[in-house]
């Protein structure tokens, strides 16, 4: 690679968080070459005996893959060139947190950085009004969750009030044995207001909005990733 | 200072089982993969298994495969090798090792604990 | 599974004497290689890594060679600590594979 020992590149990565059982990308870019063959893409993780991928001279190169990676990643081929050099997750696991390096060589020099990936489950909730209750009551649903997450109710009308006494949580594993369904149950709900269910781990923040009037419902969800800086 | 301690070799039956520890201090324990090695007496080295820092990968020599197995706790700086079907073959100073950090950058084996002796007879 | 062959298996030297034992692996494992050294009743101390890489701490006159399926390690000018037995140790990807090893006794 000619020159490529004597400067470095710059690396770009974003930490991130994958939602065990789905695919997810380790976000990494830098400063691009005019021809795909001088350009070597690394991925590596921390305490892992082989490579997580490997791509180079314009194609994956997987002989030294480890065993945990195997079958599950890819780069974006086509926009290497561009310098993108993230890579694709399959079926992210829970063992799949930690840290990751993004190592690259181009004829113009090498460069790395590291990244944080966090995994858990997340996703959004669903509010509810229960009519089978005796009394006003709203049902907040959230199906995957890991690890254990908080759950807090908030109102609009009742601003900083405290609904721990009126309401009850729980958590029911789901049948991978890894992941919960989250329910939380809102008592004594008063119409004319909107009620929030946040639920939230060090993953993830998840909130489900309801407006209740005599007249309508509406409802909207919002899911947040912590500690991504994307 | 990095070291590692182990423990639970002893006298076992053919056919018995046996869990070693290795107690580490003085690095990140999770960032390191870590191995165990084994020396049957005035014998060569063996390298037996290893298990990823986080402990999701684990990786055994083909002569222990399906009767040891490998694990760690990260929370206790611990690693663990539990030994079951043993054999008088098995018998040997067992040495924990601290394994690579990252693949093809860092040392590996480069601290080793003092070895715990296993002996399998009847 | 990898084999690794050392050779020889013995030797006789003397302080001062130039010292070359080499390790030959069953198929490529590119430069990823290391030396041991081990005293009896002692646990293995690492010399080299990555085939030619000097441990920090380890005396100069212990150097590395080789790439691919053929390796060497020599001692420049044999010191009377020297007197142990040497082990290499192939760490391509997942497996790790030592050498039989390889004695150096005084002559």
């Known amino acids: 690679f000619g020159i490529s020992g004597r400067h470095s590149i710059t690396v770009t990565t974003v930490a991130s968080a994958g939602n065990i059982g789905e695919d997810g990308i380790l976000s990494c870019t830098f400063e691009p070459d005019i021809k795909l063959s001088d350009i070597v893409i690394q991925w590596l993780k921390e305490g892992v005996l082989g490579l997580v991928h490997e791509f180079k001279e314009g194609k994956d190169e997987l002989s030294e893959q480890d065993e945990m990676f195997r079958g599950r990643t890819a780069v974006f081929a086509d926009q290497v060139i561009v310098g993108n050099a993230s890579l694709r997750l399959k079926n992210v696991q829970l063992t799949d947190a930690g840290t990751y390096k993004c190592y690259i060589i181009t004829s113009k020099g090498k460069g790395n950085a590291n990244l944080e990936y966090k995994t858990g489950a997340f996703s959004m909730p669903e509010v509810n009004v229960d009519y089978n209750a005796s009394s006003e009551t709203l049902r907040c649903e959230a199906p995957r969750w890991f690890p254990q997450p908080t759950v807090v109710w908030a109102s609009q009308v009742d601003q900083g009030a405290n609904f721990s006494e009126v309401s009850n949580t729980s958590f029911e594993l789901n049948s991978e044995n890894v992941t919960m369904k989250v329910v939380s149950v809102l008592y004594n709900v008063t119409i004319n207001n909107t009620y929030s269910c946040m639920i939230e781990n060090d993953i993830a923040k998840a909130t489900g909005d309801i407006k209740v009037t005599e007249s309508e419902i509406k409802r909207r969800s919002h899911l947040q990733l912590l500690n991504s800086k994307a | 200072e990095v070291q590692l301690l182990e423990s639970g070799g002893g006298l076992v039956q053919p056919g018995g089982s046996l869990r070693l520890s290795c107690a580490a201090s003085g690095f990140t324990f999770s960032s390191y993969a870590m191995s165990w090695v084994r020396q049957a007496p005035g014998k060569g080295l063996e390298w037996v298994s290893a298990i990823s820092g986080g402990g999701g990968s684990t990786y055994y020599a083909d002569s222990v495969k399906g009767r040891f197995t490998i694990s760690r706790d990260n929370s206790k700086n611990t690693l663990y090798l539990q030994m079951n079907s043993l054999r008088a073959e098995d018998t040997a100073v067992y040495y924990c090792?601290?394994?690579?950090?990252?693949?093809?950058?860092?040392?590996?084996?480069?601290?080793w604990g003092q070895g715990t002796l296993v002996t399998v007879s009847s | 599974d990898i084999q690794m062959t050392q050779s020889p298996s013995s030797l006789s030297a003397s302080v001062g004497d130039r010292v070359t034992i080499t390790c030959r692996a069953s198929q490529s494992i590119r430069s990823w290689l290391a030396w041991y050294q081990q005293k009896p009743g002692k646990a293995p101390k690492l010399l080299i890594y990555?085939?030619?890489s000097l441990e920090g701490g380890v005396p100069s006159r212990f150097s590395g060679s080789g790439s691919g399926t053929d390796f060497t390690l020599t001692i420049s000018s044999l010191q009377p600590e020297d007197f142990a037995t040497y082990y290499c140790?192939?760490?391509?990807?997942?497996?790790?594979?030592f050498g039989q090893g390889t004695k150096v006794e005084i002559k």
């Open positions: 990555k085939a030619s």
């Open positions: 140790q192939q760490y391509n990807s997942y497996s790790r594979t």
């Open positions: 090792a601290r394994d690579i950090q990252w693949f093809g950058e860092s040392t590996l084996f480069d601290y």
